[in-house]
């Protein structure tokens, strides 16, 4: 199943993948699409990059803003809307026979969430993995998942692509607020 | 308009080569994945092999693979299907078909060239 | 693999009566799904892609329709040029495979 990322409506989406390119600076041809990875290529094409740089990108809203040489091919989508929700597929197609690697991405965009003040945590997200709250530049976003664990840093690894996960920053933690995603 | 042009086929011993070529023209042959699909006479279709834009990546059938070799020459606008190793269940019309341009269907086909394989 | 099966194999049908053409997947291929038309002797011809997407140049009376394991064609009202054999393929799961066929004869 694929990891889901929650945006908010205006902010921009940021959907991790990566491959370490060998030797350094020995790019291939990725592709990012919307819709799940079909046996070849990508479906609806957003952004295509070849072994030097991007050669297609559907809107201007599409960029690969990591260190694309160093095999950094996250996806950012800015100023994200209703319509940006669904399944996406990052394809990197290293060379050879049936090399490709493919990650399916699911983003979430929501309306902007309120920071409210909680008496209690709320428990509406019970997913023992969490579901991620992206709205900066070029990370995710801190978000927290009430009732579970404590702080936790933990950072899952396929293939190509890393997650990481974050907790509260202590000041929100200490004002008792929340973020109410549902 | 797009057209795709295969020629190569004919008569092949068993355990013998053969070497198909898809001329194309038309499009912007060097973004496309290019298929080989077959079809035994009076069976169904069969695909083979494909071959992403750059000639980066190539795919097989189970049936094929280490047998048959899928290129292309994007200064030529060729594809090419190397067959070796030729067996009788290979008898089939192959077909060289271009990719939609999203992964998940051929829009357009060639002709098609008969490849026989008998003693 | 991905299984893709064909119903009926054989469609006995009258010029302007509606055809119904059904693809079953042994296991869920989403909607990366196509229709081909082929008529004897020539090469396939793409009707419909994604489940339900007519392909350029195609006539509306064809449609697709489906998701997930069950895909339907459907022809609202066969002209004498869509007698031919038709064939479903998926490219969600590999490898790529393609139905058998259906036959739409002239009854």
């Known amino acids: 199943s694929e990891v889901e990322y929650i945006a908010e409506v205006g902010q921009n989406a940021y959907l991790p993948c990566s491959y370490t390119p060998a030797p350094p600076g020995n790019l291939v041809p990725v592709c990012w699409g919307k819709g799940a990875c079909p046996v070849f290529d990508c479906s609806n094409v957003v952004l295509r990059t070849d072994n030097r740089d991007v050669n297609d990108r559907t809107s201007g809203r599409y960029w690969l803003k990591g260190d694309f040489h160093k095999g950094d091919v996250s996806l950012t989508i800015e100023n994200v809307t209703l319509a940006d929700s669904g399944v996406y597929c990052c394809r990197i197609q290293i060379p050879g026979i049936m090399n490709d690697e493919k990650h399916n991405v699911k983003l979430v965009v929501i309306k902007p969430a309120k920071v409210t003040p909680a008496p209690t945590l709320q428990r509406d997200l019970t997913s023992a993995f969490p579901r991620m709250l992206t709205t900066g530049e070029h990370g995710p976003a801190e978000t927290q998942t009430p009732g579970s664990l404590p702080d936790v840093n933990l950072t899952v690894s396929n293939f190509f692509c890393e997650l990481q996960i974050f907790t509260l920053t202590n000041e929100l933690r200490d004002s008792g607020a929340t973020i109410r995603t549902a | 308009e797009v057209q795709l042009l295969e020629s190569g086929g004919g008569l092949v011993q068993p355990g013998g080569s053969l070497r198909l070529s898809c001329a194309a023209s038309g499009f912007t042959f060097r973004t496309h994945l290019i298929s080989w699909v077959r079809q035994a006479p009076g069976k169904g279709l069969e695909w083979v092999a494909a071959?992403?834009?750059?000639?980066?990546?190539?795919y097989y059938a189970d049936s094929v693979k280490g047998r048959f070799i899928i290129s292309r020459d994007n200064s030529k606008n060729t594809l090419f299907l190397q067959m070796n190793s030729l067996r009788a269940e290979d008898t089939a019309v192959y077909y060289c078909a271009k990719d939609g341009g999203s992964g998940s269907y051929d829009d357009f086909w060639g002709q098609g060239t008969l490849v026989t394989v008998s003693s | 693999e991905t299984v893709l099966t064909q119903s009926p194999v054989t469609l006995s049908l009258s010029p302007g009566e509606r055809a119904t053409l059904s693809c079953r997947a042994s296991q869920s291929v989403g909607s990366y799904l196509a229709w081909y038309q082929q008529k004897p002797g020539q090469a396939p011809r793409l009707l419909i892609y994604?489940?339900?997407n007519r392909a350029t140049g195609i006539p509306a009376r064809f449609s697709g329709s489906g998701s997930g394991t069950d895909f339907t064609l459907t022809i609202s009202s066969l002209e004498p040029e869509d007698f031919a054999v038709y064939y479903c393929q998926q490219r969600s799961n590999w490898p790529p495979t393609f139905g058998q066929g259906t036959k739409v004869e002239i009854k």
């Open positions: 071959i992403t834009g750059s000639g980066g990546s190539t």
């Open positions: 994604d489940a339900s």
